[in-house]
């Protein structure tokens, strides 16, 4: 909501999760792994990489089925705490200028830092209008105090807020699982909010920094290395 059409394939780590229709976004973090939101879980997912217009075959797409879909063991469907999942692709993505991985964070998100949020979600705060072309939004990371004041009792240490307290610019339905990137690092995953782009109701995002060890451990545990003696 309140964003702009991204320059074509300018967000090469952005993926669309498809189950007969686009339902969530995600981020490519290595040639065979995608991170998304826990509440985007489905047992069968096709990951679509290299997308810009999700309704048109433009020639840069890679459609790869999920081989493994791993939701965080402490995901809470009511509070959306630990709203993160990992998808192992059935075959590695071909990395190129239009499809490439985003780095995991080396430090937690800092208030005031500019970030890029992207997705194919609803662009209206009242009503619905789902775009075909990838939308981008530049937005600042808010302080934890501002975040907690916006959602009293709802914000855990695994969440942070990004956006504008005045409203008008935000992620929305269909953006879940997608990236929040600051300084070339995946700081957030689109998670939840009360409505979209409402005053004093900024978007809430999963704090990826808290899950770097889980991500690395899960990838290691689900990668088959053949040792030749």
């Amino acid at each position: 909501v309140g964003g702009y059409i991204c320059e074509e394939n300018s967000v090469p780590y952005q993926v669309s999760l498809n189950s007969g229709y686009h339902f969530c976004g995600g981020s490519l973090i290595s040639e065979q792994w995608v991170v998304s939101a826990g509440h985007c879980y489905k047992s069968r997912i096709q990951v679509r990489l290299g997308e810009h217009n999700i309704e048109v075959l433009e020639g840069n797409e890679q459609f790869i089925n999920a081989a493994k879909i791993i939701r965080h063991p402490k995901y809470n469907s009511r509070t959306l705490d630990n709203d993160i999942l990992l998808i192992k692709l059935s075959s590695p993505a071909v990395i190129n200028s239009r499809v490439s991985a985003i780095s995991l964070p080396t430090a937690p998100p800092a208030a005031g830092t500019e970030s890029l949020i992207s997705g194919w979600g609803n662009t209206l705060s009242s009503g619905a209008d789902y775009p075909d072309e990838l939308q981008c939004l530049d937005a600042p990371v808010l302080s934890q105090a501002e975040c907690e004041a916006s959602y009293p009792g709802k914000i855990t240490n695994n969440m942070f807020c990004v956006g504008f307290l005045e409203g008008g610019k935000d992620s929305c339905q269909g953006d879940a699982g997608g990236p929040v990137v600051s300084n070339g690092e995946l700081q957030g995953i689109v998670s939840w909010g009360y409505g979209c782009a409402q005053k004093n109701r900024p978007g809430v995002y999963t704090k990826v920094y808290n899950y770097v060890d889980w991500i690395k451990d899960t990838i290691a545990a689900n990668s088959h290395h053949h040792h030749h003696h």
Epitope: G20, Y130, V190
Partner: antibody, heavy 126, light 106 residues
């Protein structure tokens, strides 16, 4: 409180197009998604599709080639057209509203249907 | 398409009995499973959403449980007004209904 009322011809000839309208009263059509469901006599329920006032639609893949849904916000109505009907399309047709706004997660998903019309019987016969 | 298999297709129980209906999905649908009650000549009525959440105004004798592929709907103490057909419905990917379970009084 929101109420739904289906209307349309009770009899349609084979190969023709079935057309139904659902009128929403007691509330605005603008916020939720709106569905069509049908039920052949003595049988189970089959979801046909859903529409939003923006025109955003999802159709049952098995019926997709024959279904068109539209919405008229000025009249607080939404409509169903089902083309090339056969006797197998004879059923009670229901319109319904879903609980779109009960969750705050930002995925695209489907929702349970909490308000239904009373249904209208459509018979396909020559 | 996700197929929903409900059992039994019909049952007969006495007033006060505990009634259990099961629903099985052809693939994992997490908790995206709802239960409806339909009385003869009437539209379905939502009872339970997201597997276990009771819809507002629905009596507490109705409950639901399960996750993944296997779900259960329970009436803790059957009442005469509970005579109806009950349907499970998944909304994980598009929407499909189970075949229904007709509940009668002995």
């Amino acid at each position: 409180q929101v109420q739904l009322q289906e209307s349309g011809p009770g009899l349609v000839k084979p190969s023709e197009t079935l057309s139904l309208t659902c009128t929403v009263s007691g509330g605005s059509i603008s916020s939720n998604y709106w569905h069509w469901i049908r039920q052949p006599a003595g049988k189970g329920l089959e979801w046909i599709g859903r529409i939003h006032t923006s025109g955003s639609t999802f159709y049952n893949p098995s019926l997709k080639s024959r279904v068109t849904m539209s919405v008229d916000t000025s009249k607080n109505q939404f409509s169903l057209k089902l083309s090339s009907v056969t006797a197998a399309d004879t059923a009670v047709y229901y319109c319904a509203r879903d609980i779109t706004n009960y969750g705050s997660g930002k995925s695209i998903r489907f929702y349970p249907m909490d308000v239904w019309g009373q249904g209208t019987t459509v018979t396909v016969s020559s | 398409d996700i197929q929903m298999t409900q059992s039994p297709s019909s049952l007969s129980a006495s007033v006060g009995d505990r009634v259990t209906i099961t629903c099985q999905a052809s693939q994992d649908i997490s908790n995206y499973l709802n239960w409806y009650q339909q009385k003869p000549g009437k539209a379905p009525k939502l009872l339970i959403y997201d597997a276990s959440n009771l819809e507002t105004g629905v009596p507490s004798r109705f409950s639901g449980s399960g996750s993944g592929t296997d779900f259960t709907f329970t009436i803790s103490s059957l009442q005469p007004e509970d005579i109806a057909t009950y349907y499970c419905q998944q909304d994980d990917t598009f929407i499909t209904f189970g075949g229904g379970t007709k509940v009668e009084i002995k």
